[in-house]
Amino acid sequence: QKVTQAQSSVSMPVRKAVTLNCLYETSWWSYYIFWYKQLPSKEMIFLIRQGSDEQNAKSGRYSVNFKKAAKSVALTISALQLEDSAKYFCALGE
């Protein structure tokens, strides 16, 4: 299993939307991809979950564009606020 986030950093103005890309490899038949936000304290905050057999997930300002064939799961954060400045991680799980 493997997860790759190619963007090391992104800069965006407030009020816009940003897309964070994540590519993965897995041999699992059924799985979930999770997006987390890491606070300066290093605490990880769960944002949204995408199931391998589910429609694109959406929760508040977070939405996922899931392309199963391309093994791509992009997180879009809309209506950006200063508090969104952070490190974002995607994770793969069964």
Partner: antibody, heavy 117, light 111 residues
Framework: DVQLQESGPGMVKPSQSLSLTCTVT?????????WHWIRHFPGNKLEWMAY???????DYNPSLKSRISVTHDTSKNLFFLNLTSVTTEDTATYYC??????????WGQGTLVTVSA | NIVLTQSPASLAVSLGQRATISCRAS??????????MHWYQQKPGQPPKLLIY???NLESGVPARFSGSGSRTDFTLTIDPVESDDAATYYC?????????FGSGTKLEIK
């Protein structure tokens, strides 16, 4: 879920002002998005008119700037459109919508406004 | 103002076939690594419905038959395969630069 609903007069006389209200339920208008007015003309043209942000800042289409204002009432979760000196060219269906950098995901059902003597 | 030119103005596509709609911007709508172009479907008496955001992202709840592609000034909405419920007018819209602008619309008829 987020819902928007436009209200106002269906008929306005030329040279008068048009005032519309957008009632937002399911989300606070101070919660981080921008709140827009868009109109749809009979010939199928869509025109963005203006927005008011969650913080109260506004931006207007330059083609309407001299005639338009948008305000909000955060205590009632409403925002408003005022368009002055209307003509028959302002006859359209008026929509309010929410936007946060990735398109207008939420719209009201629209209200038809006819400008006629 | 950024002008969005849609083509064709109308098209008729047989059930089960592919429909392709083009949107060309008078200047680039790319910024900060995103293409700020979106696609909507509108049926008579209804507000526009967001289908695709940021050029290629499928809005939640929209069938995977809809897809978007493109960057800078040239964008495409593809519906494959077309179903009878897809008869509607489709619009592109940019929000890279104020004032936000919409395309002139493409009316899709299903044969």
């Amino acid at each position: 879920d987020v819902q928007l609903q436009e209200s106002g007069p269906g008929m306005v006389k030329p040279s008068q002002s048009l005032s519309l209200t957008c009632t937002v339920t399911g989300y606070s208008i101070t919660g981080g998005y921008d709140w827009h007015w868009i109109r749809h003309f009979p010939g199928n043209k869509l025109e963005w008119m203006a927005y008011i942000s969650y913080s109260g800042s506004t931006d207007y289409n330059p083609s309407l700037k001299s005639r338009i204002s948008v305000t909000h009432d955060t205590s009632k979760n409403l925002f408003f459109l005022n368009l002055t000196s209307v003509t028959t060219e302002d006859t359209a269906t008026y929509y309010c919508a929410r936007e946060g950098g990735r398109g207008f995901a939420y719209w009201g059902q629209g209200t038809l406004v006819t400008v006629s003597a | 103002n950024i002008v969005l030119t849609q083509s064709p103005a109308s098209l008729a596509v047989s059930l089960g076939q592919r429909a392709t709609i083009s949107c060309r911007a008078s200047e680039s709508v790319d910024g900060y690594g995103n293409s700020f172009m979106h696609w909507y479907q509108q049926k008579p008496g209804q507000p526009p419905k967001l289908l695709i955001y940021l050029a290629s992202n499928l809005e939640s709840g929209v069938p995977a038959r809809f897809s978007g592609s493109g960057s800078r000034t040239d964008f495409t909405l593809t519906i494959d395969p077309v179903e009878s419920d897809d008869a509607a007018t489709y619009y592109c819209q940019q929000n890279n630069e104020d004032p936000f602008t919409f395309g002139s619309g493409t009316k899709l008829e299903i044969k």
